[in-house]
């Protein structure tokens, strides 16, 4: 039950995160005109990854796409690439995770296959989230650098009668959406990976238990060689009768391949 909840919650959180990454990528407000300590203008500028916009005080808004590919800064291209990679990985992760959900039955899909798919989608969500966070952070760093450069320019070359105003840009809403969305996708991915551990069936049998016969101190290992190696008739993960009752807490499983994420 807990595994299903963790997997379901991981899926929902990732879904919200990826929706947020898509929204952030499409948003025009990656950078907005800095209004602090600036002359108040009747025009407000803001820029996105794909176009720049100008909103006049009257409400009239005009947006122009970046119709060049080669003329754009390399950093902007890198941010675009990171965001697109994040969206693509996230979308594939969502598709995979839908089939991996424990609550959804698809034919005779085994738990081991679902566990693998859950792990795959989890990793994809983690990478997707990291791509989004990296993309937004690169853009934010670019803004900070440009902000201080333009601030320095504002206070130089003012000896003449005519002053020029440099438009400075600061963090736009899309950056915060991107950071939050990337974080959610990352958290969702981690949750999927955690859920995967619970979904993974035991690949080894229960640990051998010592039985003490009256008057003797003989250790009895049920299942013999087969039980300890996993070869032979027990490869299908059937539980071998161990001849003794035990509580759930006493059952110890060896680490499976899904434990190291």
């Amino acid at each position: 039950m807990a595994v299903t909840a963790c997997q379901g919650l991981g899926f929902v959180v990732s879904l919200i995160g990826i929706a947020g990454i898509i929204a952030a990528t499409c948003m025009d407000q990656w950078s907005t005109q800095d209004l602090y300590n600036n002359p108040v203008t009747a025009v407000f500028n803001y820029q996105g990854l794909w176009r720049s916009c100008v909103r006049e005080s009257s409400g009239f808004t005009e947006c122009r796409g970046y119709f060049t590919l080669l003329g754009l800064p390399a950093m902007l291209q890198a941010v675009r690439a990171l965001m697109i990679v994040g969206i693509v990985l996230g979308a594939i992760g969502l598709l995979v995770s839908i089939f991996a959900l424990k609550c959804i039955r698809i034919g005779s899909m085994e738990d081991s296959a679902k566990a693998n798919m859950t792990l795959t989608s989890g990793i994809m969500f983690i990478v997707s989230g990291l791509c989004a966070i990296a993309g937004v952070s690169v853009f934010a760093n670019m803004l900070v650098t440009n902000f201080w450069m333009s601030t320095a320019n504002m206070y130089t070359g003012m000896g003449g009668m005519v002053q020029t105003v440099q438009t400075r840009y600061t963090f736009g809403a899309a950056l915060f959406v991107g950071w939050v969305a990337g974080g959610l996708t990352l958290i969702g991915g981690v949750m999927m990976c955690i859920a995967c551990r619970g979904l993974a069936p035991e690949e080894t049998n229960y640990k051998a238990v010592s039985y003490h016969a009256s008057g003797h101190s003989v250790a009895y290992k049920p299942g013999g060689f087969k039980a300890s190696t996993g070869f032979g008739s027990n490869t299908k993960n059937k539980k071998i009768y161990d001849g003794g009752a035990r509580t759930e807490d006493e059952v110890q499983s060896y680490p499976s391949k899904h434990d190291y994420v």
């Epitope: 916009c53 005080s57 009257s58 438009t167």
Partner: antibody
Framework: QVQLVESGGGVVQPGRSLRLSCAAS????????VHWVRQAPGKGLEWVAV???????NYNSALMSRFTISRDNSKNTLYLQMNSLRAEDTAVYYC????????????WGQGTMVTVSS | DIVMTQSPDSLAVSLGERATINCKSS????????????LTWYQQKPGQPPKLLIY???TGESGVPDRFSGSGSGTDFTLTISSLQAEDVAVYYC?????????FGGGTKLEIK
Amino acid sequence: QVQLVESGGGVVQPGRSLRLSCAASGFSLTTYGVHWVRQAPGKGLEWVAVIWAGGSTNYNSALMSRFTISRDNSKNTLYLQMNSLRAEDTAVYYCARAAYYGNGLDYWGQGTMVTVSS
Amino acid sequence: DIVMTQSPDSLAVSLGERATINCKSSQTLLNSGNQKNYLTWYQQKPGQPPKLLIYWASTGESGVPDRFSGSGSGTDFTLTISSLQAEDVAVYYCQNAYFYPFTFGGGTKLEIK
């Protein structure tokens, strides 16, 4: 069609207050911004204030402390409250609609004369 | 505040001739975001309110005759009347439509020679 009609002007003593009105028709004050511009006799135009469609306001820094722009959306009427009037406030006061493009003023009223004199 | 300086203060031009009015702002009116200059030109005839002629420094308002044109960028702007007509006798004002407070130039009185 778009029409702006100013009223409330007249002769007033220095230090007194006056409220000008601008009745707008043919458009809504919640869709377009409206400016107040004044012109002293034989002088040039002086921008006074604006109230934008969203309700935000901007003023001429020299007049900001004494003048207040407001509107009544239900009456589609704009107001200019003028306090502590001085002789130099004597002028024709125009209200003008903000154009949708370029921040220009595309429709003007005929103006109302305000004379500040003792 | 932005200072708008118009020149000349008055201008006399013969009918059919070209009239040129200049306007200079103390700061650039060019918006980097859309590469538009937020300068507006108005015409005011005696006893009438001003009339919008040109916005964005060079875009003519609808209904304004083609003989009126605007040019310039940054801080220096020009209003040109290609062929002066009798009805063009008026005072012409430029306006900063970029920075608050919006400011007008002192005006240029255009007369017929």
